[in-house]
Each structure stands twice: as C-alpha cells, then as structure tokens.
C-alpha cells in the first residue's frame, strides 16, 4: 500500500541496508524510492542527537514484510519509500538548503553572483552533484560569493554541516535543465578503456545505457555482449567516468558496445523502465518467491505488483502439464541487477515495470503510426487536445499538447480576445470533433499564462501554458508528449508531424477527425528567404514541403508539430503562423519549443 | 615545500608598463587565491588587487582600477601582474602573497606564504 | 575604505621584556584581522589570523586578542630575533587595508 506521510519523532527499528546523508526527509524519502531495495527508512534531523556528525543521516531500511517496528524517538522522522506507490516519481530536487553544507569532494571553485548561478553552474558541469554558495554575508572575505562545485561516489553528500551564511543544493540534470550535450549514439565494436566506477550485468546496451544514465559517477560505459570472447565477462556493463567526462581511448574491439550517460536527457529516454523481454535467458538472483503463471507477460506483471521484485524468470510449462502454465521465479539483488545472466535455458527473462513510474510518463511508447491517409486513428497522438472557447457559442479554438498531469502547451495567439479561461474548454482523448456533446466531460482552465513578451504570432514569443484545475489520469488515449532536450540541441529531427483539426485549406471549416501530415524540417536561413518581410528568429523553426500541399492551417495553431526520435516523441514546435496554408515555398512557422524549455520549467514547476 | 618565487628587478620609463610573474610550486596552485601587495621605499604594505587563479576571476583596489591587470597560467602555475602607465610614485617591491583554500569555506586567514619581492624602479 | 591605525609608530623595549602592540579600525572589523612580521630586506610573515589564531610555526610567545575596532599584538618575551616591523591588516572588506605598521627597537 502506498504511505505518502512522514512520521514524525518516530524510528523504525532494524532492517538497515545503508546510510546516506540527506538535506531533509522529504530528500531521503526520494533516495530511499530510486534505491533498489529501499522499503522504508529513518531520517534523524538536528535535534535527534547530541552529536552533530549524526545530524542528517537517511538510513535506508528493507523487510520481508515491508514493515518494521516503531520506536518513540524525539528529532527522527520516518516513512516508506513511493515505490508501493503509483504516482509519478521525480528525482528533481530544486529545494535551497540555507546555512547547511554538503560534503563531498570539492573540485571546482568560482564565483558566481547568486547560488541560483552557481546551481545553474554545477546542473551544466558534467562531474557535479551538487554544490555550496557561501552568501556575501558569509564571514570570511575571500570566500564570499565563492560556488563549490562537488561530487562524490555515490551522488549524496558524505556529511552535511551546519554553517552559518552558506546555502547548498542538488544538481538540476534531472530536472530537464542541463545544457550539458547528450551522444544518444551507441557506437558498436568499441572499448573505452577508462577507469570503471562499478559494473553489473546487463542483457544489452541498452539496459546497460539506462544503468549508467541512472548511476550518479558513471559518465560512460563498455557493454560486453553475449559473443564476447571472454565467457567470464559476458553480458558485463561497465560502468566509467574521467576527469575531462570524454572516453581517454577507444579501443576496437569486435562484440563490444559503448556509448554515453544520458544524464543531461533523462526526462525524455526510459532510464529505470526495461520494458523488453529476453529470450532464451535466465536472470540469476536471490529468490523472492516461484508461482506458476500462465505466459511471460504474467510473469512480469506478478513481479511488479510484487514491491520487492526486481527481476524474473519465467521458465514455460514443459508440453500441456499443470494446465499450460509455468513456473514465474520473482527476483532481486543488491543492486537490481542480475547477478549472472544465462543464455541458452529456454527461460523468458525481464524486469518489473514498477520503476517506469520514475520515468516521464511522456517516454512511453505509444501505438505504431498508422503509415498512409491523412485521418489520425484514436490514441495515435495521445497528447493532442482541443480547445474549445464557450463564447459566444462553444466552438474548437485551437490545438494544445499534453506536456504534464495538469499543463497544456499551446500558443499565444489562440487567446486574442478571450477575457478570462472561465470560457475555456480542454477536450482531451478525442478523436473527433462530434463525440463533444453536452455532457461530455471536459478540464476546466484555472489560469492563462502567456509569454509576457508576446506581441503577435509574427514576432516570436508564441507559446502559453494552461494550467488545468483537475489533474489529468494518464490512459492509452491520453499522455504527455515530452519536450525537448536541451541537451539535444543538434539533434535533426527527420520524423515530423503535424496534426490538428484545423482547415484542410485556406476557405474550409474545422475538420471531424483529427488530422495528420508528415512535414520535414526547414533550417532557419532556407526559411528566412521564404519570408523576406518577416524576420524568422532562432526562437522560431520552419517546416514544410518546397512544393507545399501539405501543412498546418487555420484551426491548427497551438497544437503540436511532433517528432520522434529514439522511440520517443517531442514537442518540437508549436502551430503559429505562415503566409496562407500549404503554399508552395511557403513553409508553416513554428514556436521552437527548446527555446522555451527553461520559461515552460519556471512556470509549471513554480 | 610551498613557495613563491616571483621574476627578477625592473628598471622602467614613465609610461611604461611592467609585467611580474609569481611561480608557485608545493601545492595546487588553482585552490588558493593570489594577492598582490606592494610596498615603497621606506613605506608600509598597500594592497592592489586578488586572482582567484581556479575561474581567473579578480577584485583590485580602486587606486590601481584601470591600471592593474592580473591574470594566471594554470599549465604553468604562474600569476601574472601587469601595471601600465608607470609614474615614479609606483617605485616599489612588489610581493606576491597567497590567499585563502578556496576549496573548503574557512572563516579567517591570513597571507600564509609570500614571493621573495620583485623591486620595479620606475624612472627617466 | 577601512582605515587601520597602528601605535605607536615605535616601540623600544628591551629584550626579555613584554611588547604591547595596538591596531584600531576605523569601523568594525569582528574578528577579520591578521598581523605580519617584516624584517629588512625580507616579506612579510603571517604571525596571526582571526585576530588571535596563531599561525602555522609561530612560538607561543606571540598572542593577538581583540575584536571589532581595538586589537592587540602582544610579544609576552622579547627576543632578539623579533625586532622588526609589524602590521595588522583586516580581511573583512575590500579593498584589504594594513596599518602603518609599528617598529619595534632595542631600547
């Protein structure tokens, strides 16, 4: 069951794994839930103890039965880790700790003209983990305004102390704020022959990548697979850092992949989710549990409703015995990682789906694209809403994109002329216009927020957010689409598309069902040239065909130009403006979500 | 050990400008801050100016604003302090003195290692 | 700026015997203040920080005290070797400032 509350003064005795030390509980609570095994833990505060080296301690606790006893005690704060729950998990901490210091290696020392500067500092710096700002109130001189850049081994502080005029805090890069680059690339028949910071089993890269990404040290790793010369290091993931962040030397080697830490990218990849199944391979590990389940989807599902299952094998039912079901052996280990990987058994091997929670939700795959005709088909762009406006009579207004649980992006311009959102509609999961009916429901808009340096659709700044007054239940047919990574800044995007049920051409009417065109990207210049009169800013990003025929139009603004990537669909643009609809020459004009990225956070994070 | 060895004696016009340099060898050059302080025939210490030789950052005294110019080589270890528009009034020692650990938040200090001295004779 | 003031200019004592030296700031400085010792023809060396902390190889016989304006150098037994110069300087605001520094002579 899932226990969001903290218990105050309240200890749970036994069943420590680690210690960790941690700004506040509300901090250790989240380290608690992206640890393997963590169930529950304890977090002594300043007034628990006498002894100042106890102070912020987060000891990590796990049970059998996922309880533990409790123990009176003045200054400690309990609780259970969210992995019993079903929300969204977010490893983001924005939180300022004042007159606290976080210990860790301190390896880099500057001034910076606020700690919100010095944040930003250590979020675009490869190495750090967080940081201390010592204030210019701090008593020594020299030191004032000085921002520490640290890390340590395992991403947490080694210590924290009190000390007076100084403010600490985490590392961004998990909240979608680095501008630190992203090399989405796995590059095969490589070795990078750098120090290893730990190393786990893995059945691919790819799970391999996901570890490293989820690893505090690891910047980079080598992946052995299963042909691999070596039988002792098959399958072996491992995990690497250097003092530049870049591999010192790339060896080739045959049956070996490496690639990078997508740190810097998280919110828009799967990093805890391994939602693939493998063949033929069995997961070794202690045993939680053996239950015969029919089918290996069963399997999986059972591991994660199981709390403590990391992992399973499921080994298929020999013939027609026991009624065609098989045995499900539940898993787990340390670190959440096979400790051995076997091929060749017959087995289906996989992991829990319980951590794809602390993934976005937008990363989820979706249903494959309906390749050909330009109707979208229901649940093909989850994220795609519509406006509706109630005044004078109700009539759609504009498209909007799903980008989290209570937020709709869209554009500026869609509000000219409307007073207040009290007349404002959002429709989401629909496919066509005429399912709306009177008592269809729909989410109220609580606030408008437009970009205050928005004029017009023409000179940039066409974006706004509406913030809804009922939080959103993800389904199939309903999702957040995520936004850009800044960190794939030089990303070229070649699967685009643009949907809305906007006119087909420039005197038409609001089409029935949703619909969609594959549109390739424009660069900037090539786009400038189109629109001599205009001035197309880096805030901006063009798409169209040369010939024209296909592209956004009236009804379409606000809603989103979509494109895939990695398996993963983002929000590359907003439906602004252009000269007519799918002329020739003439490509359709886009707000550049990425450029917005930091204004979308500020707001919806506030 | 830790030491500062700072470049040999100038002889220099009015007008001119004059560039010493200050090695520092014993420790990680790029932990700690660098001052400059320079001291007149027969006078007392004036301080001129702070390098904080990690970020190259600098802070000098508004006497020497516009004059002074401080500046590091982390391959080298070296910090650099460049006075134009000499006039006979800057005739001095010039001294390189270490700063605070700027890797840990101490609260006092003081300048725990000085360079021998560099002797600037500025005249016609 | 902090104008630091050292008295007096000199001080003649004898060797064995204690030395008091005095440094006032022209507003308060808490704790910022450092004193050097500068013999001819040699740099300055750090004898105090912190306005009493003991550097690093200095004998006990030297002790700062004081806080805010008024300081104190105090040389408890004056021995040959610690005839020379002193200055106080404040760490506590920019620009640095020293004081003129007190000359301590064999009477």
């Known amino acids: 069951e899932c226990v969001t509350r903290l218990f105050k003064d309240i200890h749970f005795e036994g069943g420590d794994i680690a210690t960790v030390f941690t700004p506040s509980a509300k901090h250790c609570q989240v380290v608690c839930t992206h640890h393997p095994r963590c169930l529950l833990f304890t977090f002594t505060g300043e007034s628990a103890s006498e002894d100042p080296t106890q102070w912020f301690t987060c000891v990590l606790k796990d049970s059998v039965t996922e309880t533990l006893p409790r123990v009176n005690r003045t200054g400690a704060i309990s609780g259970y880790s969210f992995k019993q729950c079903s929300h969204q998990i977010s490893a983001c901490n924005k939180d300022i700790y004042v007159d606290l210091d976080m210990k860790g290696i301190n390896y880099n020392s500057s001034l910076a003209k606020s700690a919100q500067e010095c944040q930003e500092r250590c979020t675009d710096d490869i190495h750090c983990h967080f940081f201390t700002y010592a204030t210019r109130q701090f008593p020594s001189l020299e030191h004032r305004n000085i921002c520490l850049l640290k890390h340590t081994q395992t991403g947490t502080p080694t210590g924290i102390m009190k000390l007076d005029k100084v403010v600490t805090g985490f590392s961004l890069k998990s909240c979608a704020l680095s501008n630190l680059a992203c090399i989405r690339d796995v590059f095969p028949n490589t070795v990078f022959a750098d120090s290893n910071i730990d190393s786990v089993m893995a059945p691919d890269a790819f799970v391999c990548r996901r570890i490293c990404t989820h690893h505090p040290g690891c910047l980079f790793f080598t992946f052995f697979s299963q042909e691999w010369p070596k039988e002792s290091q098959r399958n072996l993931c491992l995990l690497k850092t250097s003092e530049s962040g870049l591999p010192s030397t790339r060896i080739k080697k045959s049956k070996a992949l490496s690639g990078f830490s997508l740190q810097s990218c998280r919110h828009s990849i799967p990093v805890f989710c391994h939602s693939s199944f493998y063949h033929d391979t069995d997961f070794l590990g202690e045993e939680l549990d053996i239950v015969a389940v029919k089918g290996h989807e069963a399997c999986q599902k059972l591991c994660t409703n199981a709390v403590r299952c990391q992992f399973f094998t499921y080994a298929p039912a020999q013939a027609s015995c026991n009624e065609g079901k098989g045995k499900c052996y539940l898993k787990l280990s340390s670190n959440g990682s096979p400790t051995k990987i076997l091929r060749g058994t017959g087995g289906i091997s996989g992991y829990t789906l319980r951590l794809c929670k602390m993934d976005n939700e937008c990363t989820t795959k979706i249903k494959p694209r309906i390749v050909g005709g330009t109707a979208s088909v229901r649940g093909e762009w989850p994220w795609q809403v519509t406006l509706h406006t109630t005044s004078p009579t109700q009539r759609h207004l504009c498209g909007g994109s799903i980008i989290g649980n209570q937020w709709i992006l869209t554009a500026a311009h869609c509000f000219y002329g409307v007073e207040s959102p009290k007349i404002l509609r959002v429709y989401i999961g629909i496919l066509n216009q005429s399912e709306i009916k009177e008592d269809t429901s729909f989410f109220g808009v609580q606030e408008i927020i437009i970009h205050d340096q928005y004029k017009m659709a023409e000179s940039g700044y066409d974006i706004a957010l509406l913030k809804l007054e009922t939080t959103v239940n993800y389904t199939d047919s309903q999702r957040p689409i995520c936004l850009p990574s800044k960190g794939d800044r030089n990303v070229i995007y070649t699967d685009c598309w643009v949907t809305g049920w906007g006119y087909r051409k420039l005197r038409d009417k609001i089409q029935n069902t949703l619909q969609k065109a594959k549109i390739p990207l424009v660069t900037n210049d090539e786009c400038q040239k189109r629109y001599r009169g205009h001035k197309i800013t880096h805030k901006m990003i063009c798409a169209g065909y040369r010939e024209g025929g296909k592209d956004a139009c009236k009804g379409d603004s606000g809603g989103p130009l979509s494109c895939k990537h990695n398996e993963v669909w983002h929000l590359v643009g907003i439906t602004s403006w252009g000269e007519g609809c799918a002329q020739r020459e003439r490509p359709g004009v886009y707000t550049n979500v990425l450029e917005y990225v930091d204004w979308i956070l500020e707001k919806t994070q506030a | 050990q830790v030491q500062l060895v700072q470049s040999g004696a100038e002889v220099k016009k009015p007008g001119a400008s004059v560039k010493v340099s200050c090695k520092a060898s014993?420790?990680?050059?790029?932990?700690?801050?660098m001052h400059w302080v320079r001291q007149a025939p027969g006078q007392g210490l004036e301080w001129m100016g702070i390098?904080?030789?990690?970020?190259?950052?600098?802070s000098y005294a508004q006497k020497f604003q516009g004059r002074v110019t401080m500046t590091r080589d982390t391959s080298t270890s070296t910090v650099y302090m460049e006075l134009s528009s000499l006039r006979s009034e800057d005739t001095a020692v010039y001294y390189c003195?270490?700063?605070?650990?700027?890797?840990?938040?101490?609260?006092?200090?003081?300048?725990?290692?000085w360079g021998q001295g560099t002797t600037v004779t500025v005249s016609s | 700026e902090i104008v630091m003031t050292q008295s007096p200019a000199t001080l003649s004592v004898s060797p064995g015997e204690r030395a008091t030296l005095s440094c006032r700031a022209s507003?308060?400085?808490?704790?910022?203040l450092a004193w050097y010792q500068q013999k001819p023809g040699q740099a300055p060396r750090l004898l105090i920080y912190?306005?009493?902390t003991r550097a690093t190889g200095i004998p006990a016989r030297f002790s700062g005290s004081g806080s805010g304006t008024e300081f104190t150098l105090t040389i408890s037994s004056l021995q040959s070797e610690d005839f020379a110069v002193y200055y106080c300087q404040q760490f506590n605001d920019w620009p640095l400032t020293f004081g003129g520094g007190t000359k301590v002579e064999i009477k």
């Open positions: 507003q308060s400085v808490s704790s910022n």
């Open positions: 390098i904080n030789p990690s970020g190259g950052s600098t």
């Open positions: 014993g420790y990680t050059f790029t932990s700690y801050s």
């Open positions: 912190g306005a009493s």
């Open positions: 003195a270490r700063g605070a650990y700027l890797m840990e938040l101490y609260y006092y200090y003081g300048m725990d290692v």
